[in-house]
């Protein structure tokens, strides 16, 4: 008789999840000499221990602490790039500007990027059929709690000028409910972070509006200013040219506004 299984609204655990996490860990530690000491089997055991046999709507940040400890990594605190709803461009940027880091350029972010996972209460099985959806089922699910935990730590670690890439094509350029808006903004440390500089990425080639005047950007400015962190904002009118100029800053066309 097949055992009854909770049906959740979200997609199930990513296929070959354990193998993927382990392989990513090995690859990351090979590429990043400062993380060569990391034991990837221990990392997987800690990752698994955070959600296996636990109700997938009852996960806490505490569950992830062993993994956080194993994945402790020092990034230059003044080289942090946050992003919201524009992950691909942010990652393209840090691939070119190698001294800057998104969360997904750290070990823990790299391990979990684009993956879904959850377990079942009281069994050691991984649920490949369905996992809780943040909106429809519950917010304290394994994936959401993981990203909340690592995002909080990443923001807390930042210093000096922190950059955030925002999607100017969306109706809410700054969304209070995004991970950036609900977690990272509130965990920047005012005694360490001097300025939050927003880069608003334009979508249309003919879009010459100043999106830094958008009401949601003004809302971000207000939140940041109340925390006694300075704020600045730049329009990136031509993201393609922006990336090209990061690659080749000496190019004569890179002196004009991008």
């Amino acid at each position: 008789v097949p055992r009854w299984r909770q049906q959740w609204s979200g997609p199930g655990t990513t296929k070959r999840f354990p193998e993927t996490v382990l392989a990513r860990c090995v690859k990351y530690t090979e590429i990043h000499p400062e993380m060569r000491h990391v034991d990837c089997q221990s990392v997987w055991d800690a990752f698994k221990g955070a959600f296996i046999s636990k109700h997938p709507c009852n996960i806490t940040e505490e569950d992830y602490q062993p993994l956080m400890k194993l994945g402790t990594q020092t990034v230059p605190c003044n080289k942090i790039l946050l992003w919201s709803r524009i992950k691909d461009l942010a990652h393209q940027f840090t691939q070119v500007q190698r001294d800057m880091f998104t969360l997904e350029d750290t070990l823990l972010g790299y391990l979990a990027d684009d993956l879904t996972w959850c377990g079942e209460f009281n069994t050691s099985k991984i649920n490949y059929q369905s996992c809780p959806d943040w909106r429809k089922d519950c917010s304290n699910n394994p994936v959401s709690v993981f990203w909340k935990t690592v995002s909080r730590r990443f923001a807390e670690a930042a210093c000096d000028v922190v950059h955030v890439m925002l999607n100017g094509s969306r109706s809410k350029i700054f969304d209070k409910n995004s991970t950036f808006g609900s977690v990272e903004v509130h965990n920047l440390q005012p005694e360490k972070v001097q300025t939050l500089e927003a880069w608003v990425i334009h979508g249309g080639r003919e879009d010459s509006r100043d999106l830094c005047q958008d009401p949601t950007i003004k809302e971000l400015e207000s939140i940041i200013s109340k925390r006694n962190i300075q704020f600045s904002c730049k329009n990136i009118y031509r993201p393609d040219k922006f990336l090209q100029c990061v690659k080749n800053p000496e190019d004569s066309s890179c002196t004009s506004e991008i």
Epitope: T74, C77, N78, E191, K192, Q194, Q230, S232
Partner: antibody, heavy 116, light 111 residues
Framework: QIQLVQSGSELKKPGASVKVSCKAS????????MNWVRQAPGQGLEWMGW????????TYADDFKGRFVFSLDTSVSTAYLQISSLKAEDTAVYYC?????????WGQGTLVTVSS | DIVLTQSPASLAVSPGQRATITCRTS??????????MHWYQQKPGQPPKLLIY???NLESGVPARFSGSGSRTDFTLTINPVEANDTANYYC?????????FGQGTKVEIK
């Protein structure tokens, strides 16, 4: 290049007020907070506090709450330090220094002498 | 407030030798693996000049003779080899916790 240029030396009597200016050039004043640091003659450095140049909000170290006021005029890219009810022990060189928490850019300093 | 104690208060070094200044803090100035400790050089009549930021990062334009090390509560500024124009006062400063505080200074003289 980035420069912070301060106003000249001041000789004041006890009880008077003084306003020291710090003009920023080579960058947007409102992008980085401005700190003030005091150095009494032959002594070390004391952080007085800073002003958020974007919002104008000042933060004062405990020893500098009361008679010391940080202000801005962003139209002329200038930060100000005003000291009222001057005392002999306020005699010092006052520096403005640009954030972040480490100060890569300093004004040349303004000597304020308080003497009757 | 975090108290910074520099030692020695003064030292005299011959050109070509190594000078070492230490700075001890009353509590850790580390956060997420970054040490918020900075070093300055100040010559008479001049403002301080940043040498090292966040414990070990050499400020642009500063000679590689200057280096910084340490973490948590114990930090070191090393000048090797010392040159005649290194005569100055040297200060450590923390920015891990408001209020920012400085060490009392170390006077370096060249013999």
């Amino acid at each position: 290049q980035i420069q912070l240029v301060q106003s000249g030396s001041e000789l004041k009597k006890p009880g008077a007020s003084v306003k020291v200016s710090c003009k920023a050039s080579g960058y947007a004043l409102t992008n980085y907070g401005m700190n003030w640091v005091r150095q009494a003659p032959g002594q070390g450095l004391e952080w007085m506090g800073w002003i958020n140049t974007y919002t104008g909000e000042p933060t004062y170290a405990d020893d500098f709450k009361g008679r010391f006021v940080f202000s801005l005029d962003t139209s002329v890219s200038t930060a100000y330090l005003q000291i009222s009810s001057l005392k002999a022990e306020d005699t010092a060189v006052y520096y403005c220094a640009r954030y972040p928490g480490w100060f890569a850019y300093w004004g040349q300093g303004t000597l304020v002498t308080v003497s009757s | 407030d975090i108290v910074l104690t520099q030692s020695p208060a003064s030292l005299a070094v011959s050109p070509g030798q190594r000078a070492t200044i230490t700075c001890r803090t009353s509590e850790s100035v580390d956060s997420y693996g970054n040490s918020f400790m900075h070093w300055y050089q100040q010559k008479p009549g001049q403002p301080p000049k940043l040498l090292i930021y966040r414990a070990s990062n050499l400020e642009s334009g500063v000679p590689a003779r200057f280096s910084g090390s340490g973490s948590r509560t114990d930090f070191t500024l090393t000048i090797n080899p010392v040159e005649a124009n290194d005569t100055a006062n040297y200060y450590c400063q923390q920015s891990n916790e408001d209020p920012w505080t400085f060490g009392q200074g170390t006077k370096v003289e060249i013999k």
